[in-house]
């Protein structure tokens, strides 16, 4: 039975040219996280495998940095980065948990950054 829940940074906004941390946290389960996939729509951004470490998709290598923790840092943001991002936690023995973050990249310099948290 899947008892866990995913907490995310929710809906966030950031300035064009800036950077933002996408963060998810899996709680309320003792399941082992074996892999976390980060996707934008249906495009793979990065994988963090518990044993093998990070893989960043070649097309995003210049603008995506791993971490902090199992999160992902997006850099040099453009308006085209606006959209849904998904953290997909693959766990044993529970299975798959998915979190959703909506990022809006604004031209304005008064973009409010959503609350961010770190995984302890």
């Amino acid at each position: 039975m899947m008892t866990g829940t995913i907490e995310t940074t929710g809906n966030i906004s950031a300035e064009k040219g800036g950077s933002i941390i996408l963060q998810c946290h899996l709680s309320s389960t003792t399941a082992q996280v074996t892999q976390v996939n980060w996707e934008q729509q249906d495009q793979l951004l990065a994988i963090c495998n518990a044993d093998l470490g990070w893989h960043i998709s070649p097309s995003f290598k210049d603008r995506v940095a791993p971490g902090p923790g199992l999160g992902l840092t997006l850099q040099s943001l453009t308006v085209n980065d606006t959209g849904e991002y998904f953290c997909i936690y693959h766990t044993y023995p529970d299975g798959t948990y998915t979190g959703r973050i909506f990022l809006e990249v604004l031209e304005s310099s008064v973009a409010e950054h959503g609350a961010r948290f770190q995984i302890p």
Epitope: T34, N37, D42, D51, L52, H90
Partner: antibody, heavy 123, light 107 residues
Amino acid sequence: QVQLVQSGAEVKKPGASVKVSCKASGYTFTSHYMGWVRQAPGQGLEWMGIINPSMGATSYTQKFRGRVTMTRDTSTSTVYMELSSLASEDTAVYYCARLHVSGSYYPAYLDYWGQGTMVTVSS
Amino acid sequence: EIVMTQSPATLSVSPGERATLSCRASQSVSSNLAWYQQKPGQAPRHLIYGASTRATGIPARFSGSGSGTEFTLTISSLQSEDFAVYYCQQYIVFPWTFGGGTKVEIK
């Protein structure tokens, strides 16, 4: 040309261990992860795990954790797969197979395969 | 883990005919799917990656399609050397898993 040459067939008693080798040639050994796949007689393919020949990092399928050890020797471009506490259900052909992509574990499709090593577990 | 299910288990086809093999994933694997061919006593041979891209040296009669959870391998006109067992494999979530295989036999 890329070649993966595996060690010869083995016959083992239940409870024993087996160590299969896979010698690589024709490419830069440390640039490609190596996977291990097994196939029981008349059955399908079963993924066992993977090793990064550069760093030695490994990832094993849950089913085999605690029983399988994958290692490498960069001086001889050889990877090894050791399986312990053998039972009759471990009777299978064991294959090493190279991941196509250079320098990463993704995308993990297997472009070159060893010829296979038959391991028979029988009392 | 992601379960890959292939159908049918056995496909009886006459030489020159078309063969259509199916592979279904228990959850989306996007286009992260490969196909392999295996003949008796031999190691598997890589045919397709990215669900639809042929590996180097693979004849054009082999084509792959699909995305998400439903995939198809089509052999447009079966040659005698194509009678074998075919496996699909997902490579987006560890452990990477194979389907149970489809045996293509001579009708």
